[in-house]
């Protein structure tokens, strides 16, 4: 008789999830010499152990601690790029500017990027049919707790000038409910971080408004200032041209004419 299975509102575990995590781990450790010591089978076992046989609405940060320990990685603390609702551009930027790092440029972020996973209480099965949705079902689900945990640690590690890319096309350029707004902002360490510099990325070709004056950016500035961290903001009016100039800063069109 087939067992009754909980039906969640969100999509199920990404197909071939175990194979994908293992393959990503192997690829990452081959490309990054400083992580060559990592045993990918142990990483997968720790990842699996965080959510298998557990109720997918009852996951804690503690469940991920063995994985966090195995994935411990030192990134230059002054080269951190956070992002909110503009992941693709942030990743394009760090692919060109190789000394800057988003969370997804670290081993743990790379393993889980764009994946979904969950298990079932009291069985060793992975649920490929459905997983809890953060809003409709529960917030303490395996995916949300994972990203909350790694995002918190990433923000805690940051120092000096921390950069964040924000999407200027959104109605809320800074969203208090995003991972950046709810986790990372509150875990920057004022004794280590001097400045948070926001880059507001414009969407429209002819959009020359100063989006640094947006009420949500002022709200971010207020939160950051209250935490004794300086705040700075820049409009990136032409993200396409900006990336081109990051790739080739010597191009004459990338320097102001005298």
């Amino acid at each position: 008789v087939p067992r009754w299975r909980q039906q969640w509102s969100g999509p199920g575990t990404t197909k071939r999830f175990p194979e994908t995590v293992l393959a990503r781990c192997v690829k990452y450790t081959e490309i990054h010499p400083e992580m060559r010591h990592v045993d990918c089978q142990s990483v997968w076992d720790a990842f699996k152990g965080a959510f298998i046989s557990k109720h997918p609405c009852n996951i804690t940060e503690e469940d991920y601690q063995p994985l966090m320990k195995l994935g411990t990685q030192t990134v230059p603390c002054n080269k951190i790029l956070l992002w909110s609702r503009i992941k693709d551009l942030a990743h394009q930027f760090t692919q060109v500017q190789r000394d800057m790092f988003t969370l997804e440029d670290t081993l743990l972020g790379y393993l889980a990027d764009d994946l979904t996973w969950c298990g079932e209480f009291n069985t060793s099965k992975i649920n490929y049919q459905s997983c809890p949705d953060w809003r409709k079902d529960c917030s303490n689900n395996p995916v949300s707790v994972f990203w909350k945990t790694v995002s918190r640690r990433f923000a805690e590690a940051a120092c000096d000038v921390v950069h964040v890319m924000l999407n200027g096309s959104r109605s809320k350029i800074f969203d208090k409910n995003s991972t950046f707004g709810s986790v990372e902002v509150h875990n920057l360490q004022p004794e280590k971080v001097q400045t948070l510099e926001a880059w507001v990325i414009h969407g429209g070709r002819e959009d020359s408004r100063d989006l640094c004056q947006d009420p949500t950016i002022k709200e971010l500035e207020s939160i950051i200032s209250k935490r004794n961290i300086q705040f700075s903001c820049k409009n990136i009016y032409r993200p396409d041209k900006f990336l081109q100039c990051v790739k080739n800063p010597e191009d004459s069109s990338c320097t102001s004419e005298i």
Epitope: M100, H163, Y237, C254, S256
Partner: nanobody, 119 residues
Framework: QVQLVESGGGLVQAGGSLRLSCVAS????????MGWYRQAPGKQRELVAT???????NYAHSVKGRFTISRDDAKNTVNLQMNSLKPEDTAVYYC?????????????WGQGTQVTVSS
């Protein structure tokens, strides 16, 4: 928002020299061209020298041969060596990115450093 701190200005006689220095924090300043700008009383701010991240330099006609811009990315600094100073060089000097403003804004200016050249 103290990301650009200029120093080294002062009062100097015509024909004298000064070395301006600017400490710039943030990745934008490391990746892109940097420039020294100046603003004389009652005049518009003008760009007098630029240096790309690769070290290529460009100068305004009025300062060519007298001013030299340099950068040290390890120390996050941009310098302006000013020789054979003239009274018309009197201005507040600022450093900032020298990217066309249609790409990235230059909203965050430092306090500048005053250069006064007496005749």
């Amino acid at each position: 928002q103290v990301q650009l701190v200029e120093s080294g200005g002062g009062l100097v006689q015509a024909g004298g020299s000064l070395r301006l220095s600017c400490v710039a924090s943030g990745i934008i300043f490391r990746i892109f061209s940097m420039g020294w700008y100046r603003q004389a009383p009652g005049k518009q701010r003008e760009l007098v020298a630029t240096i790309t991240s690769g070290g290529n330099t460009n100068y305004a006609h009025s300062v060519k041969g007298r001013f030299t811009i340099s950068r040290d990315d390890a120390k996050n600094t941009v310098n302006l060596q000013m020789n054979s100073l003239k009274p018309e060089d009197t201005a507040v000097y600022y450093c900032n990115v020298a990217i066309p403003s249609g790409i990235v804004d230059r909203s965050a200016w430092g306090q500048g450093t005053q250069v006064t050249v007496s005749s």
